[in-house]
């Protein structure tokens, strides 16, 4: 009986530390500001590092600019997004700006985006400062399902801080689906 | 059989449950704002209450000004900042402010800081209104090894609010490191 | 001996299965436009949706304008809440703004209110501007026992943005109370 | 594909009036600063007019400057330069560009239109 | 306004040939600078932008170089299809000048 035991308890252990690590995907990915669009209006960023600094990702897939979820469950969802601009840079095309982020939602299978949350300030940066800086920051608690794609939106992308610490998004699951 | 059976059962409710507990460590810090800095230059804030109103922590150790990691693991990382000024404090030295938080990471093995996360904004701060404000809020998940260390830089810290509710920050374990 | 350690591995994972979905309470409830107090002042939202879009709740109760707490434990609490104008929408009374968001706890028991965390900004929206918005974002980790309500306090609630993915606040159950 | 398309011009008589127009495509067009520049016949080119992607901000080169007037319809995707008070010197055709920064100023013009010419003669 | 002076106006080179041109700001423009191609009855064709980035699907040949007053386009081996002409194009405060133009032809 103390055999079997051991074994109900070892093969336990192994269930449980092994549903535990499996149930609890999560990923943290940092702005690649190598390819960062220069537009000024609402364009998805598809460069994110995965695996460098404090880049990273576990069962969950970044693909095609899309943090891809690869388990059902629900998910504390977070973004966080610094715009900056420096008077070296040059001169700003307008003074009023609308820095903006949205974190949206795609499904595959009915082929639809919806945004989850969104954030972000008016802004009037003048010419007045050599150096001006606004962080956004957005999260909060989702149900996501197998295949369903989470990507980020902006505004004034070219106005992104390319730091780790600054321009990041992320998510980790907290529980299953009933 | 039974009795074997009760004893299994008893003892992984036993495990389950010290597991589950050892395996979250948590804290949430609020400022001290009897020795907050004076200037308006960026600097480490040391003085918060780990016991008292919101405060609180576990599996954690709060020392030095610095919140001591006790256990490897995956942990969510926050904090909320806000800054004040009325004109009743007395004029501004400048109207213009960087008002900035860092999240920084110190590892002791190898004597080093890193910044996990920032936000925060420039603001115009006129004398035209006699109440100012701004909150900033930042949060990320990092993976933490036991005797690193999470500490909060602030720029202008003479403006920090010093209400439990308004500048806080903190951490929860939410996964074991595979 | 097979069969009993079946039933073991069985009433275990039942047992796992039901103490982590009981242990999990979570609520992310999205703001309900029809019905936004009107002024300037501070008031508690009493109207948020709990079962359309994203909004969703599970072991927790949604009643009289607060979310309730039904099994005690330590949560992670958060809120997003977005306002905005546009010239459109008329003249402001004033300019100068203070846009704020209280995350408040109450106790039945002890009939009393406490904030928890509080977040915003004043602003300047002048009418150089056609359109403005901003965006408050704040987060923590709190101790809640069954039977307290948390609720949401804004300032200027006309200007609030009524989208679901701009005005939420929520909570999710990280672990148990020691 | 990305493109501009030019349409308007003509021939007018001194102190007439015309009104440019540039279609775009293939592009976000609100979220682009676009200018004006015409070239003279036989001569170099010369800077006309710029407008901010949102329109707020609007520059003009000294020699235009109370007399045209640029504006732009994000709806439509269109930009436009209205000419009031025409010279024989502005005599030219005119080239729609776009700023190669949606945000800042000074990285220079990426894609043109085809021209149109505008002939002020009595 | 910032005048801006191109030299030479005409410039005579062979296929193979490497190529020089300068553009000269009255005052200090810092980095704005553009260059442009342009063939006869065409739109101009941006090159270079912020005085040494090169557009995009733009051949390697060409670059730039310079900053504050005194900027160079550099075609490294000329090609038949380079005969054209090169403008330098400044941006500062709120301001946009061509320069006259440098028409490289057929020695």
């Known amino acids: 009986i103390r055999a079997e035991k051991a074994m109900v308890d070892g093969s336990w252990l192994d269930l449980a530390k092994r549903s535990k690590l499996e149930a609890q995907p999560f990923a943290h990915l940092t702005i690649n500001a190598t390819d960062i669009p220069s537009g000024s209006h609402k364009v998805s960023l598809s460069s994110w590092y995965h695996d460098r600094g404090w880049a990273k990702i576990s069962n969950m897939t970044f693909s095609n600019g899309k943090l891809i979820v690869n388990q059902d469950g629900f998910y504390y969802l977070y973004a966080n997004i610094c715009f900056r601009h420096h008077e070296t840079s040059g001169d700003l095309a307008t003074e009023y700006l609308q820095l903006m982020v949205y974190v949206t939602k795609t499904s595959i299978k009915i082929p639809s985006s919806h945004t989850l949350m969104k954030g972000g300030s008016t802004k009037y940066w003048s010419g007045n400062s050599e150096f001006h800086f606004y962080s956004i920051n957005v999260g909060g608690f989702f149900k996501l399902r197998s295949g369903e794609e989470i990507s980020i939106e902006v505004s004034n992308p070219s106005l992104l801080d390319p730091d780790q610490d600054a321009t990041y998004f992320g998510a980790f699951k907290v529980r299953d689906i009933d | 059989i039974r009795a074997e059976k009760a004893m299994v059962d008893g003892s992984w409710l036993d495990l389950a449950k010290r597991s589950k507990l050892e395996a979250q460590p948590f804290a949430h810090l609020t400022i001290n704002a009897t020795d907050i800095p004076s200037g308006s230059h960026k600097v480490s804030l040391s003085s918060w209450y780990h016991d008292r109103g919101w405060a609180k922590i576990s599996n954690m150790t709060f020392s030095n000004g610095k919140l001591i990691v006790n256990q490897d693991g995956f942990y969510y990382l926050y904090a909320n900042i806000c800054f004040r000024h009325h004109e009743t404090s007395g004029d501004l030295a400048t109207e213009y402010l960087q008002l900035m938080v860092y999240v920084t990471k110190t590892s002791i093995k190898i004597p080093s800081s890193h910044t996990l996360m920032k936000g925060g904004s420039t603001k115009y701060w006129s004398g035209n209104s006699e109440f100012h404000f701004y909150s900033i809020n930042v949060g990320g998940f990092f993976k933490l090894r036991s005797g690193e260390e999470i500490s909060i830089e602030v720029s202008n810290p003479s403006l920090l609010d010093p209400d439990q509710d308004a500048t806080y920050f903190g951490a929860f374990k939410v996964r074991d490191i595979d | 001996i097979r069969a009993e350690k079946a039933m073991v591995d069985g009433s275990w994972l039942d047992l796992a299965k039901r103490s982590k979905l009981e242990a999990q309470p979570f609520a992310h409830l999205t703001i309900n436009a029809t019905d936004i107090p009107s002024g300037s002042h501070k008031v508690s939202l009493s109207s948020w949706y709990h079962d359309r879009g994203w909004a969703k709740i599970s072991n927790m109760t949604f009643s009289n304008g607060k979310l309730i707490v039904n099994q005690d434990g330590f949560y992670y609490l958060y809120a997003n809440i977005c306002f905005r104008h546009h010239e459109t929408s008329g003249d402001l009374a004033t300019e100068y703004l203070q846009l704020m968001v209280y995350v408040t706890k109450t106790s039945i028991k002890i009939p009393s209110s406490h904030t928890l965390m509080k977040g915003g900004s004043t602003k300047y929206w002048s009418g150089n501007s056609e359109f403005h918005f901003y965006s408050i974002n704040v987060g923590g980790f709190f101790k809640l026992r069954s039977g307290e309500e948390i609720s949401i306090e804004v300032s200027n609630p006309s200007l609030l943005d009524p989208d679901q993915d701009a005005t939420y606040f929520g909570a999710f159950k990280v672990r148990d109370i020691d | 594909q990305v493109q501009l398309v030019q349409s308007g011009g003509g021939v007018v008589h001194p102190g007439r009036s015309l009104r440019l127009s540039c279609a775009a495509s293939?592009?976000?067009?609100?979220?682009?600063?676009m200018h004006w520049v015409r070239q003279a016949p036989g001569k170099g080119l010369e800077w006309v007019a710029v407008?901010?992607?949102?329109?707020?901000?609007?520059y003009y080169a000294d020699s235009v400057k109370g007399r045209f007037t640029i504006s732009r319809d994000n709806s439509k995707d269109t930009l436009y330069l209205q000419m009031n008070s025409l010279r024989p010197e502005d005599t030219a055709v005119y080239y729609c560009?776009?700023?190669?920064?949606?945000?800042?100023w000074g990285y220079g013009m990426d894609v043109w239109g085809q021209g149109t010419t505008v002939t002020v003669s009595s | 306004d910032i005048q801006m002076t191109q030299s030479p106006s005409t410039l005579s080179a062979s296929v193979g040939d490497r190529v020089t041109i300068t553009c000269r700001a009255s005052?200090?423009?810092?980095?704005?600078l553009a260059w442009y191609q342009q063939k006869p009855g065409k739109a101009p064709k941006l090159l270079i932008y912020?005085?040494?980035s090169l557009e995009s699907g733009v051949p390697s040949r060409f670059s730039g170089s310079g900053s504050g007053t005194e900027f160079t386009l550099t075609i490294s081996s000329l090609q038949p299809d380079d005969f054209a002409t090169y403008y330098c194009?400044?941006?500062?405060?709120?301001?946009?000048?061509f320069g006259q133009g440098t028409k490289v032809e057929i020695k």
């Open positions: 560009a776009k700023c190669l920064s949606g945000t800042y």
């Open positions: 293939g592009f976000t067009f609100s979220g682009y600063g």
């Open positions: 407008i901010s992607y949102d329109g707020t901000n609007k």
């Open positions: 005052q200090s423009i810092s980095s704005w």
């Open positions: 912020k005085a040494s």
């Open positions: 194009q400044q941006y500062n405060s709120y301001s946009w000048t």
